[in-house]
């Protein structure tokens, strides 16, 4: 279990030790003001009490100031994501100050030791911010701390210790081990800044969760449920690197939070939207695509400030690479009769046809089971903007197309050999677009033919009432 009381071991061991002089040792925490997008360019080093570098390097007191805080490191050197993030911030906010917090000597340790160093690094950042606050025109409200992994909790400590309140902290997959369930002041929390937004991309409910599972911000966004990220499977990383390993999968999923944030900076015209939901399963059912009462938000840099009384967990699906944006649809299918279903859950696919494009064949994920005489809700998403939807093709996969279903079919036949043909009846499909918040009802092409059975398809066209807006707020509209 963790060593109580942080940086120098147990609390009672924290006696005041004399500090080493500047000539003896390089400081463990350095503040590198990045004056160029070029990672080879050295930039300027800032230190508390020394105003000259601020002037020499044109530190803009009235502009936004970003502090990028790395996490635990096995290599002891800056990773590529950091340079990409610096470059993206410079591209998006040309006048801003971008400061890289270099705590590599304290992070290149055993993980437990690096964790125990987070408090002291947070304190160093707070001291730097307290000193900057003494300057005319510098405002803590313009400060945005961006921390990855262990760096997210360092940002939390900085926000905790600083005199005043920083404007924003973004936690990019905050570290899980030794922080899950930790005291509010011992991890990133909503109290640490005026707005704390968090991206969770490597959470696991089984085994070791590299990223923290519990919400720690004002808004906590869980792309793809916060666990398995598209493009990060063993097959994917095996294809892209010479020696694919589990380590690469971990890195891919954990680091995905950074790339989602970079994407939000550089692909401003393709924002990804997340939707508030109590849990991942409900989101997968398509229940949570509302934008009412601040229930949706942009992710990453463009997130709108939300300070709810209670934490807001938000979900979205993404593509496997940049730009990560997808288009979410809620599909409500009312099954009004059900014939000889047996024990097999049907496997449905839909194809959406729009004014701009047609989708691929998309599976309808049955999270629990198909209910009869009830409305069943599904989530589907497309990588391309289909425009206005025109028609939908619903296909019921035949048993032979799935080994699992074939086996269940066979078992069902053994117990009920004279089981007549299975079918169900669907009159209409209601669709809601997450991105536009528009709703549309589709009716069967032939009102007399509403039945569907394995290996068959049903076509639905827009019903006469067309698109309905129903007082929903589009996420593309500025949220309050």
């Amino acid at each position: 279990s963790p060593v109580p009381f942080g940086p120098e071991g147990r609390l009672e061991d924290k006696l005041h030790k004399p500090k080493a002089t500047q000539t003896e040792v390089k400081p463990s925490v350095r503040f590198n003001l990045r004056t160029s997008k070029d990672p080879e360019h050295e930039g300027c080093y800032l230190s508390v009490g020394h105003s000259q570098p601020l002037e020499d390097c044109s530190f803009n007191m009235t502009a936004k100031t970003f502090f990028i805080i790395h996490g635990w490191t096995m290599s002891g050197i800056f990773e590529n994501w950091l340079h990409k993030l610096v470059s993206a911030l410079h591209t998006r906010e040309k006048d801003a100050n971008v400061v890289v917090v270099d705590w590599l000597p304290l992070a290149h340790q055993l993980y437990t030791d690096a964790v125990n160093n987070t408090r002291v690094v947070g304190h160093s950042i707070a001291r730097m911010l307290d000193w900057l606050q003494e300057k005319d025109d510098f405002s803590l409200g313009n400060v945005h701390l961006i921390g990855y992994s262990l760096g997210a909790h360092v940002a939390g400590y900085a926000g905790n210790f600083v005199k005043g309140t920083v404007g924003r902290i973004t936690g990019l997959d905050p570290a899980g081990p030794m922080f899950e369930g930790a005291d509010i002041h011992k991890r990133l929390s909503p109290d640490d800044a005026d707005f704390v937004d968090v991206l969770h991309t490597y959470t696991r409910s089984f085994g070791l969760s590299i990223g923290i599972q519990m919400p720690v911000g004002h808004i906590d966004i869980y792309p793809n449920g916060g666990d398995f990220q598209p493009g990060c499977g063993l097959n994917d990383v095996l294809g892209s690197i010479a020696y694919g390993t589990i380590t690469e999968v971990v890195k891919c999923e954990h680091e995905r939070a950074v790339h989602l944030f970079v994407d939000s900076l550089v692909n401003q015209d393709k924002p990804s939207f997340a939707f508030q939901c109590t849990d991942s399963n409900r989101f997968k059912k398509g229940i949570c695509l509302s934008c009412r009462k601040n229930r949706c938000n942009s992710i990453g840099y463009n997130a709108k400030k939300m300070r709810n009384k209670r934490n807001s967990k938000m979900y979205l699906k993404t593509r496997a690479g940049m730009p990560f944006r997808v288009y979410h649809y809620q599909m409500k299918i009312h099954v009004f009769s059900y014939k000889n279903m047996g024990e097999i859950e049907p496997t449905f696919y839909v194809t959406l046809y729009g004014t701009n494009a047609d989708s691929q064949t998309l599976p309808l994920e049955i999270v629990e089971r198909i209910e009869q005489n009830a409305t069943n809700t599904f989530l589907v998403y497309t990588e391309e903007d289909l425009g206005d939807l025109l028609k939908i093709q619903l296909t019921w996969e035949g048993a032979s197309q799935s080994w699992y279903n074939l086996w269940k079919e066979f078992r069902s036949y053994l117990s009920q050999p004279r089981n007549p043909g299975r079918e169900l009846n669907i009159r209409r499909i209601r669709v809601k677009s997450g991105e536009t918040q528009r709703k549309l009802t589709f009716c069967t092409e032939d009102p007399e033919n509403t039945s569907i059975s394995p290996g068959r398809e049903l076509w639905f066209r827009k019903c006469r009432d067309g698109w309905r807006m129903k007082n929903e707020t589009s996420p593309t509209v500025e949220l309050p």
């Epitope: 963790p2 109580p4 009381f5 942080g6 609390l11 009672e12 924290k14 006696l15 005041h16 408090r119 304190h123 707070a126 905790n160 210790f161 600083v162 005199k163 005043g164 899950e180 369930g181 930790a182 005291d183 509010i184 002041h185 011992k186 929390s189 909503p190 109290d191 599972q213 519990m214 919400p215 209670r310």
Partner: antibody, heavy 116, light 107 residues
Framework: QVQLVQSGAEVKKPGASVKVSCKAS????????IAWVRQAPGQGLEWMGE????????KYNKKFKGRVTMTRDTSTSTVYMELSSLRSEDTAVYYC?????????WGQGTTVTVSS | DIQMTQSPSSLSASVGDRVTITCKAS??????VAWYQQKPGKSPKLLIY???YRFTGVPSRFTGSGAGTDFTLTISSLQPEDFATYYC?????????FGGGTKVEIK
């Protein structure tokens, strides 16, 4: 070792104020939150609020807001809790506790009696 | 505010007994729960933090478990020095809130 030493017992009249002190030693005073928790006779524990000595940031239980003030003196590593407009229900033992993993270390408690 | 409801409010047990105390949060607090022991006339002592981690010097007979809204403190074999009052507390959000306490008495 970590120690929190509180001031002595107080007897106050209704409407008066009381100021309890808590002197910390054995750790870096400025970077750990110190909470105040009270316990009425025969009752459970009630969190009143906490202070971070380095920045003097405070968090208060809204039940006590307006009546409680927490301050610190970094030169003596001491925190103070002042409760005003005392009433008989404020009769309790008041504890200070330093937070890291939880309330890791507690003071010995200060008994405050409110009686006319 | 998050309410913490502890049960039972008191129990009688003998030395060597296995004792279980439960705590229920009014909303999800994940694993951000601590347990304290308080003896008459003494200050509380931290036993368990983050739902299941024993604090320094706490005997292994004390075990914490649970996540979400339901938490348990178990004393595997009650010792004479364990007769005391036990409190749970959520440390997920401010205001911090305590359970009402469970008094463990000698049967």
């Amino acid at each position: 070792q970590v120690q929190l030493v509180q001031s002595g017992a107080e007897v106050k009249k209704p409407g008066a104020s009381v100021k309890v002190s808590c002197k910390a030693s054995g750790y870096t005073f400025t970077t750990y939150w110190i909470a105040w928790v009270r316990q009425a006779p025969g009752q459970g524990l009630e969190w009143m609020g906490e202070i971070l000595p380095g920045s003097a940031k405070t968090k208060y239980n809204k039940k006590f807001k307006g009546r409680v003030t927490m301050t610190r003196d970094t030169s003596t590593s001491t925190v103070y809790m002042e409760l005003s407009s005392l009433r008989s229900e404020d009769t309790a033992v008041y504890y200070c506790a330093v937070y890291d993993y939880g309330a890791d270390y507690w003071g010995q408690g200060t008994t405050v009696t409110v009686s006319s | 505010d998050i309410q913490m409801t502890q049960s039972p409010s008191s129990l009688s047990a003998s030395v060597g007994d296995r004792v279980t105390i439960t705590c229920k949060a009014s909303q999800d607090v994940y694993t951000a729960v601590a347990w304290y022991q308080q003896k008459p006339g003494k200050s509380p002592k931290l036993l368990i933090y983050s739902a299941s981690y024993r604090f320094t010097g706490v005997p292994s007979r004390f075990t914490g478990s649970g996540a979400g809204t339901d938490f348990t403190l178990t004393i595997s074999s009650l010792q004479p020095e364990d007769f005391a009052t036990y409190y749970c507390q959520q440390h997920y959000s401010i205001p911090r809130t305590f359970g009402g306490g469970t008094k463990v008495e000698i049967k």
